[in-house]
Amino acid sequence: AGHLEQPQISSTKTLSKTARLECVVSGITISATSVYWYRERPGEVIQFLVSISYDGTVRKESGIPSGKFEVDRIPETSTSTLTIHNVEKQDIATYYCALWEV
């Protein structure tokens, strides 16, 4: 079974800068999985943001600002990266990755 690790416990960024969050997949080939990213703002329910499927297809939640989030997959390091552009107050949250094994 696959296992996920988010090595950064926290990430502190200046407003308008870029944040990159990592999710390391082990126990399964990342190219054979879909990785999903979610965020949980303080006091709010968890929300789906973006996913990258086994074939590289990216799906973004409607209503999420365009250009705000980028998702990538690096097979060499078995890592999925969530990039948050122009960090703002609304981006303060806990971000979770999740795995769907194909």
Epitope: E44, N86, K89, Q90
Partner: antibody, heavy 126, light 109 residues
């Protein structure tokens, strides 16, 4: 001195347009979310629209959605509200207001409008 | 849409008395997202309380906020002449609109 000054209000006919401006001074404008709030004279406050510091997150009240457009120019320290297809019920004093900034690096952050302009009157009448 | 209901509509009190203003949300609101404002005639509103209980800069300690979930309270421990005004609560939920209550007027008895 931290200050917000609105301009652009006036008398306009129903169906007409106006563009409100809000000039900010005394703080780093690009670090703050901004809001427009309106108030019919003698009545309560109504939130109209909000825009985040880098303009990624933009929200509108249902009553103005599709007619009003909020925008900002961080280089000019200015906030704008483009109001189209104006109706009689849009008649109000329009305030721009700064949202609370982020203090420290904590996950505990708050919302609230801590700096307000003096308001600009918009009258929609034939 | 979260509806904020304030009570009473008008509160008639004398200087030195304690004022208790209520704000009830139609659904649960995070304490981080609840604010109180004061507005005097001809003036813009002024932020009093944010995060349900934190006083804004320069606000005297006779003003205090409390509550959680759907019920919030603004208390003025001893009314000063300058405290007679209209008070509004406001919620910032997980999605707009960021609604205000209809206001409570505190006037001199």
């Amino acid at each position: 001195e931290v200050q917000l000054v609105e301009s652009g209000g006036g008398l306009v006919k129903p169906g007409g347009s106006l563009r409100l401006s809000c000039a900010a001074a005394g703080f780093t404008f690009s670090n703050y979310d901004m809001n427009w709030v309106r108030q019919v004279p003698g009545k309560g406050l109504e939130w109209v629209s909000s825009i985040s510091s880098s303009s990624s997150y933009i929200y509108y009240a249902d009553s103005v959605k599709g007619r009003f457009t909020i925008s900002r120019d961080n280089a000019k320290n200015s906030l704008y509200l483009q109001m189209n297809t104006l109706r009689a019920e849009d008649t109000a004093v329009y305030y721009c207001a700064r949202d609370l900034g982020i203090t420290g690096t904590t996950m505990d952050y708050y919302y609230g409008m801590d700096v307000w302009g003096q308001g600009t009157m918009v009258t929609v009448s034939s | 849409e979260i509806v904020m209901t304030q009570s009473p509509g008008t509160l008639s009190l004398s200087p030195g008395e304690r004022a208790t203003l209520s704000c009830r949300a139609s659904q649960s609101v995070s304490s981080s997202y609840l604010a109180w404002y004061q507005q005097k005639p001809g003036q813009a509103p002024r932020l009093l309380i944010y995060g349900a209980s934190s006083r804004a800069t320069g606000i005297p300690d006779r003003f205090s906020g409390s509550g959680s979930g759907t019920d919030f309270t603004l208390t003025i421990s001893r009314l000063e002449p300058e405290d007679f005004a209209v008070y509004y609560c406001q919620q910032y939920g997980s999605s707009p609109p960021y609604t205000f209550g209809q206001g409570t007027k505190v006037d001199i008895k």
